[in-house]
Interface confidence: medium
Amino acid sequence: YSQLTSLDVGFNTISKLEPELCQKLPMLKVLNLQHNELSQLSDKTFAFCTNLTELHLMSNSIQKIKNNPFVKQKNLITLDLSHNGLSSTKLGTQVQLE
């Protein structure tokens, strides 16, 4: 599936997002993870997802964003983190979304 550009795994019970996902799917542009059970994001989570334009993370349990998980997403246009448990609008320790 290395040519896959869109992956919709919404409305599941995913609690882990292995960083290798985008190593295997380097062309991925749209990743929909809405309504899953992700609780933490960190630097490695999307480290290889460099071509993403849309990332949908609404309705998870993300309460902690460690360091700079979106620093590699230079092409990101849409990031949806609504309906999570975030207590701050800070999406990491440095400005990442241009």
Epitope: K16, L17, P19, Q23, E37, S39, Q40, D43, K44, T45
Partner: antibody
Framework: EVQLQQYGAELGKPGTSVKLSCKVS????????IYWVNQRPGKGLEWIGR????????IYAEKFKTKATLTADTSSNTAYMQLSQLKSDDTAIYFC????????????WGQGASVTVSS | DIQMTQSPGSLSASLGETVSIECLAS??????LAWYQQKPGKSPQLLIY???RLEDGVPSRFSGSGSGTQYSLKISGMQPEDEGDYFC?????????FGTGTKLELK
């Protein structure tokens, strides 16, 4: 900061069992995998297996399938490994480890627990 | 199981010298490779993951390269604190397997 706390040294007699613990602070183990690795005296690292604390699913290296049993308690954020039917060549340092959201990269390690098997 | 053959088994390097350690996999591991440093009595520390990604906080003198079955770790300018054991780890297939290890000493 993520920390994995392992406790001290275990002394076991041949044929008995020991249970090692690995308490994680600073990260919810439900969101990752816990790995176990051993190191015999003066030797290299050996991958024992991993557990998914969210559902209890385990994967073992073949040689540890009847030797090690991995469990986890998400309420206390602690993982366990029981070693059964101890033999002298089970004498080793046993490490627990984890990584961000799983995957093969173990980027946080416990300090190791020593197991000595002797009659 | 995938076998990871590491070479050399030991080496001695002078201060400032460039050092390379190789890891050869018995089959293609698609860059699912990490490098660890271990000092006596301590737990391993991650240096490199995904064959060439430097872990946060690791000095830039460490670098990784390779693909397919052949991978290497390079230390550009040996420092006293670089003494220790180095291991590669493949994460392409279960069971994950470590390399045989390389002991690096300061000459």
């Amino acid at each position: 900061e993520v920390q994995l706390q392992q406790y001290g040294a275990e002394l076991g007699k041949p044929g008995t069992s020991v249970k090692l613990s690995c308490k994680v602070s600073g990260y919810n183990i439900w969101s990752t995998y816990i790995y176990w690795v051993n190191q015999r005296p003066g030797k290299g690292l050996e991958w024992i297996g991993r557990i998914d604390p969210a559902n209890g699913n385990t994967i073992y290296a073949e040689k540890f399938k009847t030797k090690a049993t991995l469990t986890a308690d998400t309420s206390s954020n602690t993982a366990y490994m029981q070693l059964s039917q101890l033999k002298s060549d089970d004498t080793a340092i046993y490490f627990c480890a984890m990584g961000d959201h799983g995957g093969y990269v173990m980027d946080a390690w416990g300090q190791g627990a020593s197991v000595t098997v002797s009659s | 199981d995938i076998q990871m053959t590491q070479s050399p088994g030991s080496l001695s390097a002078s201060l400032g010298e460039t050092v390379s350690i190789e890891c050869l996999a018995s089959e293609d591991i698609y860059s699912y490779l990490a490098w660890y440093q271990q000092k006596p009595g301590k737990s391993p520390q991650l240096l490199i993951y995904a064959a060439n990604r430097l872990e946060d906080g690791v000095p830039s003198r460490f670098s990784g390269s390779g693909s397919g079955t052949q991978y290497s770790l390079k230390i550009s300018g040996m420092q006293p604190e670089d003494e220790g054991d180095y291991f590669c780890l493949q994460g392409s297939e279960f069971p994950y397997t470590f390399g045989t290890g390389t002991k690096l000493e300061l000459k």
